[in-house]
């Protein structure tokens, strides 16, 4: 107890009334107004509580403090008076803050700031929406993926910032009268092939596809090594050339270089150059046979294999190339005597005659074309005098029945040396490669060296053997007549032909010899 009569035990936030009583300070309260025991406490009065008499007024918030309270303007409002706090409604000067004016960049890009009481909102521009995680940020609406499907199915939706476009897909174009871009765009497939908008190589044929096109190898062509077929960048080569390569197991530098040249010609070949390429191929062959180099050091059998390979390949190449020629008659001759006569026609019903220096060929046009083949009909004849050297001493194989008859009557017949080649070797071909059994025969008239008296003249063809080589044969060929320097042959198939002179004496009207012819 205090001598002056003031209690010293008053609790916190109270003051003594006298020596035995205390009273809570303003802003605090206790259970009873007068505190008489030290056990009582003074607790802060929350003036801001709902039932309180304190009213801060509109656009403001009441903030309780220890022993007191403050009124402050709500967020988004500010006092006109400038006083941060006040005590009652009469002191309240709170009014709305225009955040949009204060900070024009508040809504960032693509949004417009709209002031509201105590706050603001961002209104997105057309084609934008508020980002859920940041409601103040407008982001582009992707109309193409939003499920709205705003474009026609013939178009391709292209989203761009704040908008979208309906564009024709690659290989499509707007239908007549349609725009290209707005959402009412309607498109149709472009036929690049007929409109000439394609990039197909001349070795291919253009095929239109929906919205695109592809380039396919021409018939008889194949894709170049490593390039797939049916692509926009497909480049093809004539299969004719790719198969005409040096025969296996033959080692000749001269021949290898000849085939290098052939392959070069094949690589550079374009259908429009068929005429030039035919001439280059024949010139190359003519040059090879004019100076065969190490080819003639090969064993005889290998030389025959090479000749067989050259004849077979040449026929294929010429047949393939001549399909790209325009109608008409071609005649080419070369320094070493190689000669080509070739006629190209749309199918006609007549016989055709090709004349050369040393040979004439006659056949029916209707043999030339395979039924159902839309291309032109081709008949060709090549004379290759230079082939004779490579075919020197090539064997003549007679049909078994002829052979048997001859053996019975002429012991040792054809044993005293190989038959002699009297004429140039000629090769005949058609656009139709099925020429093993012609419906009407072909006739050849050969001019040749003089026949030695009492020697037998045979019309022969070169039969390509299974082993890639071959031999002379007479099957399907007959000798119609022979004079000293010319012979007429008739054959029921096409191949390479020649006139041989057999090594034996002819008896007068020998019936066995009639069998041979």
């Amino acid at each position: 107890q205090d001598s002056r009569g003031c209690a010293r035990w008053c609790p916190q936030d109270s003051s003594c009334v006298n020596a035995t009583a205390c009273r809570c300070n303003p802003g605090f309260s206790s259970f009873s107004e007068i505190i008489t025991t030290p056990m009582e406490t003074c607790d802060d009065i929350n003036e801001c509580a709902t039932l309180s008499k304190v009213s801060c007024g509109k656009f403001s918030d009441c903030w309780n403090t220890e022993g007191s309270y403050d009124c402050v303007c709500s967020p988004g409002y500010e006092p006109v008076s400038g006083a941060k706090t006040f005590k009652n409604e009469s002191e309240n000067t709170c009014q709305d803050v225009d955040e949009c004016q204060q900070n024009p960049r508040l809504c960032k890009s693509y949004g417009t700031c709209v002031n509201t009481l105590g706050s603001y909102t961002c209104q997105c521009l057309p084609g934008f929406k508020l980002k859920p995680e940041d409601p103040k940020l407008c982001t582009d609406v992707n109309e193409c993926t939003s499920g709205q499907n705003p474009c026609h199915s013939s178009t391709h939706c292209l989203n761009n910032v704040g908008s979208y476009q309906c564009r024709c897909r690659p290989g499509w174009q707007p239908i007549p009268g349609s725009p290209n871009g707005p959402n009412n765009t309607v498109c149709e497939d472009v036929d690049e092939c007929s409109s000439g908008q394609h990039q197909c190589d001349s070795s291919t044929v253009c095929f239109n596809t929906v919205g695109s096109y592809s380039c396919r190898c021409r018939p008889g062509w194949k894709p170049r090594h490593g390039i797939p077929n049916n692509q926009k960048d497909t480049v093809c080569e004539d299969m004719t050339f790719s198969t005409w390569t040096p025969p296996p197991g033959v080692h000749s530098q001269t021949l290898s270089r000849f085939f290098d040249k052939v392959q070069d010609l094949g690589r550079d070949y374009k259908p429009g150059l068929a005429n030039n390429t035919i001439q280059s191929i024949l010139q190359a062959l003519d040059e090879l046979l004019e100076a065969p180099g190490d080819l003639e050091t090969l064993p005889r059998l290998q030389q025959h294999c090479v000749a067989s390979h050259l004849l077979d390949g040449l026929e294929d190449v010429l047949r393939g190339l001549s399909k790209n020629l325009s109608n008409g008659l071609l005649n080419f001759s070369y320094p070493a005597g190689t000669e080509l006569s070739l006629e190209v026609q749309k199918q006609v019903d007549r016989s055709v005659t090709l004349r050369q220096n040393q040979a004439v060929m006659q056949l029916d046009w209707n043999q030339a074309q395979k039924s159902g083949d839309p291309g032109p009909s081709v008949v060709g004849l090549v004379s290759i005098p230079g082939m004779g050297k490579l075919l020197a001493e090539a064997p003549l194989v007679l049909e078994p029945e002829k052979q048997m008859l001859l053996h019975e009557t002429h012991q040792g017949l054809l044993q005293d040396g190989s038959p002699i080649l009297l004429s140039d070797v000629i090769s005949a071909f058609l656009s139709n490669n099925d020429t093993q059994n012609l419906s009407s025969p072909v006739t050849f008239t050969f001019s040749h060296r003089s026949v030695i008296p009492r020697q037998k003249v045979l019309c022969v063809f070169w039969e390509h053997g299974q082993n890639g080589c071959g031999h002379w044969a007479t099957t399907g060929c007959s000798t119609i007549g022979t004079r000293d320097t010319s012979t007429i042959c008739r054959c029921t198939h096409l191949s390479s032909f020649a006139v041989l002179m057999a090594h034996y004496d002819v008896q007068e009207e020998d019936p066995v010899l009639t069998v041979i012819t």
């Epitope: 530098q253 040249k261 040059e287 100076a291 003639e296 005597g337």
Partner: antibody, heavy 118, light 108 residues
Framework: LVQLQQSGVELARPGASVKLSCKAS????????ISWVKQRTGQGLEWIGN????????YYNEKFKDKATLTADKSSNTAYMELRSLTSEDSAVYFC???????????WGQGTTLTVSS | ENVLTQSPAIMSASPGEKVTMTCRAS???????LHWYQQKSGASPKLWIY???NLASGVPARFSGSGSGASCSLTISSVEAEDAATYYC?????????FGGGTKLEIK
């Protein structure tokens, strides 16, 4: 062994003609062509022309068309080049060489030196 | 005519050095139609490299040839004294056949 043996040194007067020979051995003469090449002292090689003995076909450098005539005799395996209307410009070493349309000039003769002088 | 231009006209190298000489054609030549010949003083030319890159029989492996189209080259990886000679390129892609002017290689 392939060999091309050329005729020896030739001396000729201006305006005259000369025939150089090149005898081949060791290979099939008609399987290859014979090329003729000119080389003036201190100068490079100049192709004159080719002859292919099998056919007798000749191919000339336009520059030598009126100067040289190429021939070949299959029976003696010999190629010849005749040079006419000789001038001092024709003084040179002339080589023959074996080749084809497809093969390089793989064997050469030893050369014939031609001197044209009055 | 297809003119062949060789460069340099004369070059000098020390033994062991690598040297390259080039041959440029006025129009494209197939690689199989281009050859190189070596000619030593007072001797006949010898086939040295055929078809652009193949060494003729007896040619040392230090020689090589390369190129395509209108340009090709002859390289010696490590020059030796016996390589002193004039080297000619030659084409027979078409008539007239032509030779380059030659590159004379001198050894220091």
């Amino acid at each position: 062994l392939v060999q091309l043996q050329q005729s020896g040194v030739e001396l000729a007067r201006p305006g005259a003609s000369v025939k150089l020979s090149c005898k081949a051995s060791g290979y099939i003469f008609t399987s290859y062509g014979i090329s003729w090449v000119k080389q003036r002292t201190g100068q490079g090689l100049e192709w004159i022309g080719n002859i292919y003995p099998r056919t007798g076909n000749t191919y000339y450098n336009e520059k030598f068309k009126d100067k040289a005539t190429l021939t070949a005799d299959k029976s003696s395996n010999t190629a010849y080049m005749e040079l006419r209307s000789l001038t001092s410009e024709d003084s040179a070493v002339y080589f023959c060489a074996r080749g084809t349309h497809y093969d390089p000039l793989d064997y050469w003769g030893q050369g014939t030196t031609l001197t044209v002088s009055s | 005519e297809n003119v062949l231009t060789q460069s340099p006209a004369i070059m000098s190298a020390s033994p062991g050095e690598k040297v390259t000489m080039t041959c440029r054609a006025s129009s494209s030549v197939s690689s199989s139609d281009l050859h190189w010949y070596q000619q030593k003083s007072g001797a006949s030319p010898k086939l040295w490299i055929y078809s652009t890159s193949n060494l003729a029989s007896g040619v040392p492996a230090r020689f090589s040839g390369s190129g395509s189209g209108a340009s090709c080259s002859l390289t010696i990886s490590s020059v030796e004294a016996e390589d002193a000679a004039t080297y000619y390129c030659h084409q027979y892609s078409g008539y007239p056949w032509t030779f380059g002017g030659g590159t004379k290689l001198e050894i220091k």
